[in-house]
Amino acid sequence: KIDACKRGDVTVKPSHVILLGSTVNITCSLKPRQGCFHYSRRNKLILYKFDRRINFHHGHSLNSQVTGLPLGTTLFVCKLACINSDEIQICGAEIFVGVAPEQPQNLSCIQKGEQGTVACTWERGRDTHLYTEYTLQLSGPKNLTWQKQCKDIYCDYLDFGINLTPESPESNFTAKVTAVNSLGSSSSLPSTFTFLDIVRPLPPWDIRIKFQKASVSRCTLYWRDEGLVLLNRLRYRPSNSRLWNMVNVTKAKGRHDLLDLKPFTEYEFQISSKLHLYKGSWSDWSESLRAQTPEEEPTGMLDVWYMKRHIDYSRQQISLFWKNLSVSEARGKILHYQVTLQELTGGKAMTQNITGHTSWTTVIPRTGNWAVAVSAANSKGSSLPTRINIMNLCEAGLLAPRQVSANSEGMDNILVTWQPPRKDPSAVQEYVVEWRELHPGGDTQVPLNWLRSRPYNVSALISENIKSYICYEIRVYALSGDQGGCSSILGNSKHKAPLSGPHINAITEEKGSILISWNSIPVQEQMGCLLHYRIYWKERDSNSQPQLCEIPYRVSQNSHPINSLQPRVTYVLWMTALTAAGESSHGNEREFCLQGKAN
């Protein structure tokens, strides 16, 4: 009931709590002398369902049969309406519509750790929409039953607050949950278990790792566990990996030797525990231990390449290049590279440690037979040295690969193809494809890239350090013993017409012809490999079509003669450049008048 109900009563039959779909009878009756003054026959009783009128009646009482009430709480209020006055509230009642509890399902209990307490969970089934009390019972040995009630609205979990002990680990315990509300009760099926079934150990703690003699091959993982733990599983992975290595161990007593760790690698380790081979559940994984394994001496050998440059009649410049070892080969932080240069006939040798670079340049005599050895060193030792004899890589013309081509292959890739050399192709031990950005003037500081290809291959896809709209000088070397042959080509991964034309910087007269000189187009404006230059000229005040001369592009060329100009005629000259994608805009215009005599 609600309100004070001084003027009358509202009664509900059969009950204030009803099963969904049931009918209720609501009666509103006035107490004596509580009707409308003077006109008791004019009493008008009105029944509201929440704020909506559902029935009315003149007299001292009103009966209403109500059906179809929804799940939950519905408020009914009875009011009295008299002539010339506001409605007066008489009384009200709440009706609770719900269902009997369903049988709780999937009752399961767990005790977290040997010192933890037993907690059970279950599925309540559909909402009853009524106050429902859950009672959890646990019966076990020693003729004892524990019982706890849950009065939360949505109760599907209870912690008994008791601790099962391992004195008799095989003793049976039985748990049961009972749900009760005004419309009925229902009990779960009993869940029977032993101590070993429900105790879930705490995750291991205090995890440590030790490397004996700072060696990755002598690695022991240590941890602490609860006293009754029989089984452990270990999982570990390099920190940058998503895949775990898994190891199961029995009676480990808090230690295990790991034999397959890689050196100089950060690993993540986790451990889980279990009390029994086939009973109970695994603990949560422990907190992660992260540790880096010690270094080991490098394995593998450096990939070394070189470039020779003529200086003068007696000297040559040797530039050595090498690639970093992979992480798995370096097996530590590379502290320096050791380069040894040796003259093979005289036995003279010089050794140098290089730090922070993967290249080295020196000047040596053009005479003698020279060899180099390069190795990488970390704190534990050095890799095996890579030895190469310095030779003239392009000396053997018969070893030169044939029909070299370079074609764009998607974004920032170039496919280089060739045919084996004419000389016995089976003599080729390997091909080396080398590429570097094309810089007029042959700048030796430009980074060099290379890859090695097996002798049966006749193509290679180059993608490392390839940028769009840049022209690369590509060489293919065929190596055989102490001989080498090479062929070269220009190539780009992407091209468009150059952004500007060459700048004519001088026009000079020589024996009745002229020599035009120009500045190279800046590399960033070439937009790929240049194929041709065009020189245009026409008489200054003429409307005639210009004449043109097309000359193939060569890296070092920046002048060209023209001998078809008439003397004492003023000409306007300009230049353009072409890539495979098209022609540039005009470069600057220059005027020139040939002074020589007419023929």
Epitope: T117, G140, P141, K142, N143, L144, W146, Q147, K148, D159, F160, G161, I162, N163, L164, T165, E167
Partner: nanobody, 129 residues
Framework: QVQLQESGGGLVQAGGSLRLSCAAS????????MAWFRQAPGTEREFVAG?????????FYDNSVMGRFTISRDSAKNTMWLQINNLKPEDTAVYYC?????????????????????WGQGTQVTVSS
């Protein structure tokens, strides 16, 4: 000084009901374990029912009384009750109230007399057939 005082015993016919009370004074036991034991003539004192004292109180019963006896307490009044329904002649005994100064969480310890630090004088319950 701590005192436990039982009351509510008496002579009842089989099938009848009784409500035993245990009033504690001298200290508050609302957060600690409390229990009822009984002792029939010529037998050892045996555990009947108890409250763990852990959060929300877990009740525990000897299986022989489960479903007929209900243990409860009012922490504010420092009082514990044992409601006994459907009494049987074998329920005839002196009923003792016991209190511990700690929470009992170990499953087996609740029925041991040594778990409890304070005891009442007892109240007689006699069931006639």
């Amino acid at each position: 000084q701590v005192q436990l005082q039982e009351s509510g015993g008496g002579l009842v016919q089989a099938g009848g009901s009784l409500r035993l009370s245990c009033a504690a004074s001298g200290r508050t036991f609302s957060n600690y374990a409390m229990a009822w034991f009984r002792q029939a003539p010529g037998t050892e004192r045996e555990f009947v029912a108890g409250l763990s004292g852990s959060g929300g109180d877990t009740a525990f019963y000897d299986n022989s009384v489960m479903g007929r006896f209900t243990i409860s307490r009012d922490s504010a009044k420092n009082t514990m009750w044992l409601q006994i329904n459907n009494l049987k002649p074998e329920d005839t005994a002196v009923y003792y109230c016991a209190a511990a100064t700690h929470v009992v969480v170990n499953y087996g310890l609740v029925r041991r007399r040594g778990t409890y630090d304070y005891w009442g004088q007892g109240t007689q319950v006699t069931v006639s057939s």
